[in-house]
């Protein structure tokens, strides 16, 4: 039987001679070279060799148990004359045996890390890692120890995780930003002849809102002209923070000062500055300067810092307004007068009244716009806009009259400013009333009394205020004739009805019917209107058959009676 | 039905004031002119005032020109006359009618006495 | 100041006819249209007579009345005892834009 189990053997021999491996001896093995040794396997005869007489393996090359730690062969034993097996064909190992040949070496060449300013020590940064190719079951080649060569005081490493945290106290970003720090790693535990390698850590201290804005300034000051619309920007401040990105934002407001009902402060977002804008119209005339309160201040605050101050600042802001020769200033917007149409000309209407809002006061003169009443119905009295009427006014052609009038500084002429004038006419009852139609109507010969041959309706140019009231009578010169009878309805509406039995167109084809028709307003209007009323020829059926004059045989008479 | 109901007559010293109200129902009181009529005791009837159904046209009797303002109110169917300055002659029942059929007074209100008196 | 003028009184006994007149003048009667009221005692008028001739639903047709020109008249036939009251006569103006009324004419029937 074999006399062998496992080989060891230690790598990285740096002898000149082939590494000794040991001895492959079968007891059947009697010295006499009878017996022969093969090796077959990993590396044999190449990395291994064997003396086939006495069973001696070398090793031919330097062994680095890192690239293979351990090699598996088979061992024969043969009679040499023969061939024949005196074992049976046996498998062993030879293991490598580490040294401490590797230094530790960590996962990044570099690492990046950030951690916020002002954090309390200890707050973790990161963790670097290193690992060691040595055999970290056997003695402590593979052992790291992690320790900082650079960037105390400000950081720390754990031992044995690695692990960096912050070491020192108020650690701020506006002093110093960029920290690099060095980190050792090494084996056998970290003693003595223990093999190291190191990495560096780039830490960056993010921001913290730490910094209250600042104005540069206590007090600024501006100029505007008083035309400045609303929105237009007067000026800029800028409050700085030594802190960057949202912790930096600044926003802007008018806490106090006689100005913040006419000025606003926006901010801008991009250059963090305040614009400060005009909000209402100015008027120099009334007030020439005005002192603002402007306050810088942080909308995103960390409670933690507050303990540092408030988190705002203030300055003042004087803004100087400057004079504008302005036009003249009419009392309103727009004028709405009223006149009745039954005016006389030069009845006063109404009148205007503009000033020139400059310190100097100029005086102002006024006129109708000629464009805006071209037939001239309305003339102004240049010194002091009164309106009066220059032409009869009829509501029922024209309802509003829509004229400008012109108001122009009299010692400088281009400034001038216009005014619309919404003049009513109010109605008067000075229309009749009259038929809504021309009415023609027709009666059978044979009509019987009390027939309704025709309703008559009224329309009146007035205004309907809630709608017109009318009375329709006959003519009282046609009243006491007897052959149409007029019945007023009470609803704006009467009718025609005949008086008598029967009618002989031959002795009279048309009558004419005068008929009064009157509104119930005040003053009272009324008129007086026609209806014609044909005899004709009907069938029994009351179907007319022939009205026509010239179908009769005698001449024809045309009376008025009714 | 057409109802008319004047009030605020009374006793007033000479040169005093009142105000008469008549308040109209029954009928579209904006689509009418009105009248004050007046009746002296023991005398005939005499037209006062007329007021248009607008109210943008009003007239008056000589003898109350100048003292007397009448007025209307169509949101609120109302008939007014301001008597100032009145004098013992105003001394009558007031009464408020409707002119309609050509200019006949159809509705009459049942009179307000308006007594002028030291 | 009273425009149109009416007799003061008039008298029928019942059952007979009387009539009462007004005239006036070409701006009142002349041009527009006469009405008649009727003033029982202690009560408020009565439109009696529109359109020179019409009359209100409800007026009995023994009330009548006729224009002629610038007067009027108002004819009361088969007199009963409760038409015993004051008759007023009354036109439009059209020169002055008033209304104006007769006197007044106190009717008495008899018996």
């Known amino acids: 039987s074999w006399m062998w189990n496992q080989f060891f053997l230690l790598e990285e021999y740096t002898g000149s001679d082939y590494q000794y491996v040991g001895k492959l001896h079968s007891d059947q093995d009697r010295g006499d070279g009878s017996l022969k040794y093969i090796l077959s396997g990993d590396g044999a005869g190449d990395l291994f060799i064997i003396n086939e007489n006495t069973g001696d393996i070398q090793a031919t090359k330097r062994l680095d148990r890192e690239e293979k730690p351990v090699y598996i062969l088979r061992a024969q034993a043969v009679n040499r004359r023969t061939g024949r097996p005196v074992e049976p064909e046996s498998e062993f190992i030879i293991k490598i045996h580490d040294i401490n040949d590797n230094e530790p070496i960590f996962t990044k060449d570099v690492y990046t890390a950030t951690v916020p300013e002002m954090a309390d020590v200890g707050t973790f940064v990161v963790q670097v890692t290193a690992t060691d190719a040595d055999d970290p079951t056997y003695g402590n080649s593979a052992k790291v120890v992690y320790s900082i060569l650079q960037g105390q005081p400000y950081f720390s490493v754990e031992s044995e995780t690695g692990i960096i945290k912050t070491a020192l106290l108020n650690m701020d970003r506006e002093n110093r930003e960029q920290y690099q720090v060095v980190i050792q790693a090494k084996d056998m535990g970290g003693q003595m002849g223990g093999l190291s390698g190191t990495t560096t850590v780039n830490i960056t201290l993010t921001d913290v809102n730490d910094n209250p804005p600042r104005f540069p300034q206590s007090t600024y000051q501006f100029k505007t002209p008083e035309s400045s619309p609303p929105g237009t920007p007067i000026g800029r401040i800028k409050a700085s923070d030594a802190d960057v990105g949202e912790n930096a934002e600044i926003e802007y407001s008018i806490t106090d000062g006689e100005g913040h009902e006419m000025f606003d402060v926006i901010t801008d977002q991009e250059t963090q500055e305040g614009i400060i804008t005009v909000k209402k119209l100015l008027d120099f005339e009334k007030k020439k300067v005005y002192t603002l309160k402007v306050e810088a201040s942080n909308p995103h605050v960390e409670p933690r810092f507050l303990y540092l101050g408030p988190f705002k600042d203030s300055a003042t802001v004087r803004i100087v307004v400057d004079d504008v020769d302005e036009p003249p200033v009419f009392s309103k917007l727009a004028y709405i007068l009223q006149i009745r149409e039954d005016a006389r000309i030069n009845t006063t209407i109404g009148s205007v009244a503009a000033q020139d809002p400059d310190a100097a006061r100029n005086p102002v003169k006024y006129s109708v716009d000629r464009h805006t009443d071209m037939d001239r119905i309305f003339n102004i009295d240049s010194g002091n806009g009164s309106i009066f009427t220059s032409k009869l006014l009829d509501r029922e052609t024209l309802l509003w009259h829509n004229i400008t009038v012109i108001a122009t500084e009299i010692n400088n002429p281009k400034q001038s400013s216009r005014v619309p004038l919404y003049i009513k006419v109010l109605d008067v009852n000075d229309n009749a009333p009259e038929f809504a139609e021309f009415y023609e109507t027709f009666v059978c010969e044979k009509a019987k009394a009390d027939q309704l041959i025709q309703t008559l309706r009224a329309v009146d140019k007035d205004d309907p205020y809630s709608g017109h009231q009318f009375s329709f009578s006959l003519a009282p010169e046609a009243a006491s004739s007897s052959n149409f009878t007029i019945q007023d309805n009470k609803d704006n509406t009467a009718g025609i009805l005949t008086r008598k039995n029967g009618y002989n167109r031959h002795e009279m084809s048309t009558y004419l019917l005068p008929v009064v028709i009157s509104d119930n307003d005040y003053p009272v209007q009324s008129s007086t209107g026609t209806v014609t009323v044909r005899v004709c020829a009907c069938d029994h059926h009351g179907n007319m058959q022939s009205c026509h004059a010239e179908a009769l045989i005698h001449p024809t008479g045309l009376s008025t009676g009714a | 039905q057409v109802q008319l109901l004047e009030s605020g007559g009374g006793l007033v010293q000479p040169g005093g004031s009142l105000r008469l109200s008549c308040a109209a129902s029954g009928f579209t009181f904006s689509s009418f002119a009105m009248n004050w009529v007046r009746q002296a005791p023991g005398k005939g009837l005499e037209w006062v005032s007329v007021?248009?159904?607008?109210?943008?046209?009003?007239n008056y009797a000589d003898s109350v020109k100048g003292r007397f303002t009448i007025s209307r109110d169509n949101s609120k169917n109302t008939l007014y006359l301001q008597m100032n300055s009145l004098r013992a002659e105003d001394t009558a029942v007031y009464y408020c009618a409707r002119p309609s059929y050509f200019q006949a007074m159809d509705y009459w209100g049942q009179g307000t006495l308006v007594t002028v008196s030291s | 100041d009273i425009v149109l003028t009416q007799p003061p009184s008039v008298s029928g006994a019942p059952g007979q006819r009387v009539t009462i007149s007004c005239s006036g003048s070409?701006?009142?009667?002349?041009?527009?249209?006469v009405s008649w009221y009727q003033q029982l005692p202690g009560t408020a008028p009565k439109l009696l007579i529109y359109d020179n001739s019409n009359r209100p639903s409800g007026v009995p047709d023994r009330f009548s009345g006729s224009k002629s020109g610038t007067s009027a008249s108002l004819a009361i036939t088969g007199l009963q005892a409760e038409d015993e009251a004051d008759y007023y006569c009354s036109s439009y103006d059209s020169f002055d834009h008033s209304w104006v009324f007769g006197g007044g004419t106190k009717l008495t029937v008899l018996g």
């Open positions: 007021i248009s159904s607008s109210g943008s046209n009003t």
């Open positions: 070409s701006s009142n009667i002349g041009s527009n249209f």
